[in-house]
């Protein structure tokens, strides 16, 4: 139990969010971080994994409504599966209908997240900024 | 002490953020919420105050770097003082130099926050979305 050393009391009118890696954004008990350095999709995925996180997974417009105001384009954890035509997340789950508008802008098998729940198809080797996400239990 | 009823243990490798009002964004122990409904500056201020918060105050590019990726324009707590020509926050503090680029788009005494630390001057009676902020102790 040596890793645990903080004991806090929380007022019922407010709540703590997390736990998250230090200096990450916490929202509705999910942790998010935006990374400025441009990497390709695979490097972005590796960077998130090295921080016990994954690339952004969009699973709910309600729980993730902070994403609608995100500026610019960032890698998320969505990839195209050529053999069945579906889009799936890193965890193997299939993209739910009506969650993202997939925009056919570039020829590629990865997707960039853009504001208002849009996903722009992009070549996986193109460098871009990226969003990591860690779901709290 | 009746309002306090949760006791949590936090791993040193991660941390909790807050406390914040329920479902607000927590980042570096500040709480933020984006409101979709358009209100004039005074109504926006009143809305934030009713939630024990104030309109957004920008005080640090480092501590508030999440703001650089915010899309669109939102009321913040910055007002122009005609008598001395300065811009000040709701708490009376003066806008620090080099924190915001003030852009004179409209004639007005209030300011909208826009991505990359820009402030757009706007008429205080114009309806806009707004950002509330609560600084944790």
């Amino acid at each position: 139990n040596s890793l645990f050393n903080q004991e806090v009391q929380i007022p019922l009118t407010e709540s703590y969010c997390g736990p998250c890696p230090k200096n990450w954004i916490c929202y509705k008990n999910n942790c998010y971080q935006f990374f400025d350095e441009s990497k390709n999709w695979y490097e972005s995925q590796a960077s998130c994994m090295s921080q016990n996180a994954s690339l952004l997974k969009v699973y709910s417009k309600e729980d993730q409504d902070l994403l609608k105001l995100v500026k610019s384009y960032h890698w998320m954890g969505l990839v195209h599966i050529p053999t069945n035509g579906s889009w799936q997340w890193e965890d193997g789950s299939i993209l739910s209908p009506n969650l993202l508008t997939i925009i056919e802008m570039q020829k590629g098998d990865c997707a960039l997240y853009a504001s208002s729940f849009k996903g722009y198809i992009e070549n996986c080797s193109t460098p871009n900024t990226y969003i990591c996400m860690q779901r709290t239990v | 002490n009746s309002l306090f009823n949760q006791e949590v243990q936090i791993p040193l490798t991660e941390s909790y953020c807050g406390p914040c009002p329920k479902n607000w964004i927590c980042y570096k122990n500040n709480c933020y919420q984006f409101f979709d409904e358009s209100k004039n500056w005074y109504e926006s201020q009143a809305s934030c105050m009713s939630q024990n918060a104030s309109l957004l105050k920008v005080y640090s590019k480092e501590d508030q770097d999440l703001l650089k990726l915010v899309k669109s324009y939102h009321w913040m707590g910055l007002v122009h003082i005609p008598t001395n020509g300065s811009w000040q926050w709701e708490d009376g503090s003066i806008l620090s130099p080099n924190l915001l680029t003030i852009i004179e788009m409209q004639k007005g005494d209030c300011a909208l926050y826009a991505s990359s630390f820009k402030g757009y001057i706007e008429n205080c009676s114009t309806p806009n979305t707004y950002i509330c902020m609560q600084r944790t102790v």
Partner: antibody, heavy 121, light 107 residues
Framework: QQLEQSGGGLVTPGGSLKLCCIG?????????MTWVRQAPGKGLEWIGC?????????YYASWVNGRFTLSRDIDQSTGCLQVNSLTAADTAMYYC??????????????WGQGTMVTVSS | DIQMTQSPSSLSASVGDRVTITCRAS??????LNWYQQKPGKAPKLLIY???SLQSGVPSRFSGSGSGTDYTLTISSLQPEDFATYYC?????????FGGGTKVEIK
């Protein structure tokens, strides 16, 4: 890369017809195949699409109402459109089309030559 | 379903003219709009995808713009081979829908 269509012709009202489209020069089982029709002197109307791979996922226009069925044969690199209970309103040129890239499903840069279906007694 | 309204339905123009065709969607389609050219007896040909991206091999006199619900196809200097019918198509969501078409005729 091309799409070669077959199967059009004259059919009586109430009859059925199967239109097919063979893809060559590309990996058929990684692409969506779409069908679009155009009545004489009218505009383009999307019918539906099917994925050429193992899933065979389909989407249809809301007006189709089960009269049209999409299928595909991976081994033959062929997509087909079965049209049942034909009426005069189904008289049209029928096109198959393929998206510009395998991850696309809604933007078409490769088209078949079209096949005419005439419904008349 | 998303309705696509194209205007005008036909227009007469001369070689060298600048031609503008508009397309309005019944809801925001997030720049997911394609433009096709069709000549009599031929299959449609993709000109512009994602509202403003020029398809490979298409002359640069064709351009697309727009966002939200309103989109425009512009031919900067009409050439003899451009007399045809033009269709917009929303690529935002299934079911896919086309505009009614704009026939560009010789004045």
């Amino acid at each position: 890369q091309q799409l070669e269509q077959s199967g059009g012709g004259l059919v009586t009202p109430g009859g059925s017809l199967k239109l097919c489209c063979i893809g060559s020069g590309f990996d058929f089982n990684t692409y969506w195949m779409t069908w679009v029709r155009q009545a004489p002197g009218k505009g383009l109307e999307w019918i539906g699409c099917i994925h050429g791979g193992s899933s065979g996922s389909t989407y249809y226009a809301s007006w189709v109402n089960g009269r049209f069925t999409l299928s595909r044969d991976i081994d033959q690199s062929t997509g087909c459109l079965q049209v049942n209970s034909l009426t005069a309103a189904d008289t049209a040129m029928y096109y198959c089309a393929r998206p510009g890239y395998r991850s696309w499903s809604k933007t078409f840069d490769l088209w078949g030559q079209g096949t005419m279906v005439t419904v008349s007694s | 379903d998303i309705q696509m309204t194209q205007s005008p339905s036909s227009l007469s123009a001369s070689v060298g003219d600048r031609v503008t065709i508009t397309c309005r969607a019944s809801q925001d389609i997030s720049e997911s709009l394609n433009w096709y050219q069709q000549k009599p007896g031929k299959a449609p040909k993709l000109l512009i995808y994602a509202a403003s991206s020029l398809q490979s091999g298409v002359p640069s006199r064709f351009s697309g713009s727009g966002s939200g619900t309103d989109y425009t196809l512009t031919i900067s200097s009409l050439q003899p081979e451009d007399f045809a019918t033009y269709y917009c198509q929303q690529a935002n969501s299934f079911p896919l829908t086309f505009g009614g078409g704009t026939k560009v005729e010789i004045k």
